[in-house]
């Protein structure tokens, strides 16, 4: 599966709509800082083929849509950047649904990378604990903003990689 | 591979002005915070203050502020600290050091080679 | 701001001994703690993160300990590559600041 050129640029805006949403000085968020304990390992591409890869991203996108598609995180951000930036998420989990259907029959191993794509979940697990024991304060939502900004990058090179394979 | 270069040594007459830059390459410029530390000749190191590239919001130390202006420009990945009017007090190495952030990450991970800056007339 | 203070600020030590360098926070700041090597005319390196993180391709003789106010650098052995000068600073808080430095010299 070939992921259209449309659905990279999408990637970037994500990035640029996410970077636009902060609202507080973010120098004051210090003390904040997390180890929300980011699963690298399962986006440096290496070891996957690449329908597995496939469904990595997929879950990273579909977590990181639930997370920004909650009341509290409405009630965090400027409406009109937070939905130009879920529907952006929206046609990425669009494009890489119609890869996942199509690679299903290109290869035979299984689909679905269960430890990855459980990594991927305990990973959005414990920023969903972080910011309830920090009561979704606005510094907590800025740490948590940061890290999947960071995240995304890390999906966007994988892409990247599988782009250079075909 | 990541680095941070730093303009040339300078030298100044009292009350002259000065602009000194930091380019990094190698990473995405606007995911890092640039900070600046002064090392004045056989004294330790102090912080001066910290730019975020992406927004180009700034904090200093109160020892620095109103003394230097901390600027970057995204467009060139190139961070900056300037001085509108030196003294010979301001006599110093200058290093730059990029910082992760809100990230979970090490701080100020690299490092500019430094900038010798000497003002004297 | 908070104020970092190092002990000693200098020692004489020879190659294999195990060094100890001390810093403390004037108010709490957490695991915000790093540790540099600075060599003269040289740049400072980042050794040691989060209070205890080894940064990478830094020897592993080098260790960080402590949360709160005290922390704690040690070299477990020390090596001739190690007579340096050793900052500690806290990143907790702006203004970040440093310790005032700790001098290893070769008895």
């Known amino acids: 599966c070939d992921l259209p050129q449309t659905h990279s640029l999408g990637n970037r805006r994500a990035l640029i709509l996410l970077a636009q949403m902060g609202r507080i000085s973010h120098f004051s968020c210090l003390k904040d800082r997390h180890d929300f304990g980011f699963p690298e390992e399962e986006f440096d591409g290496h070891q996957f083929q690449k329908a597995q890869a496939i469904s990595v991203l997929h879950e990273m996108i579909q977590q990181t849509f639930n997370l920004f598609s909650t009341e509290d995180s409405s009630a965090a951000w400027e409406q009109s950047l937070l939905e130009k930036f879920s529907t952006e998420l929206y046609q990425q989990l669009n494009d890489l649904e119609a890869c996942v259907i199509q690679e299903v029959g290109v290869e035979e191993t299984p689909l679905m990378n269960e430890d990855s794509i459980l990594a991927v979940r305990k990973y959005f697990q414990r920023i969903t604990l972080y910011l309830t024991e920090k009561k979704y304060s606005p510094c907590a939502w800025e740490v948590v903003r940061a890290e999947i900004m960071r995240s995304l990058s890390f999906s966007t090179n994988l892409q990247k990689r599988l782009r250079r394979k075909d | 591979e990541v680095q941070l270069v730093q303009s040339g040594a300078e030298v100044k007459k009292p009350g002259e002005s000065l602009k000194i830059s930091c380019k990094g390459s190698g990473y995405s410029f606007t995911s890092y915070w640039i900070g600046w530390v002064r090392q004045m000749p056989g004294k330790g190191l102090e912080w001066m203050g910290i730019?975020?590239?992406?927004?180009?919001?700034?904090a200093y130390s109160p020892s620095f502020q109103g003394q230097v202006t901390i600027s970057a420009d995204k467009s060139i990945s190139t961070a900056y600290l300037q001085w509108s009017s030196l003294k010979a007090s301001d006599t110093a190495m200058y290093y730059c050091?990029?910082?992760?952030?809100?990230?979970?990450?090490?701080?100020?991970?690299?490092w500019g080679q430094g900038t010798l800056v000497t003002v004297s007339s | 701001d908070i104020q970092m203070t190092q002990s000693p600020s200098s020692l004489s030590a020879s190659v294999g001994d195990r060094v100890t360098i001390t810093c403390r926070a004037s108010?709490?700041?957490?695991?915000?703690l790093n540790w540099y090597q600075q060599k003269p005319g040289k740049a400072p390196k980042l050794l040691i993160y989060?209070?205890?993180s080894l940064q990478s391709g830094v020897p592993s003789r080098f260790s960080g300990s402590g949360s709160g106010t005290d922390f704690t650098l040690t070299i477990s052995s020390l090596q001739p590559e190690d007579f340096a000068t050793y900052y500690c600073q806290q990143s907790n808080t702006l203004p970040f600041t440093f310790g005032q430095g700790t001098k290893v010299e070769i008895k």
């Open positions: 730019i975020d590239p992406s927004d180009s919001d700034t």
């Open positions: 050091a990029r910082h992760p952030g809100l990230n979970w990450a090490p701080d100020f991970d690299y």
């Open positions: 989060f209070a205890s």
């Open positions: 108010q709490s700041i957490s695991k915000f």
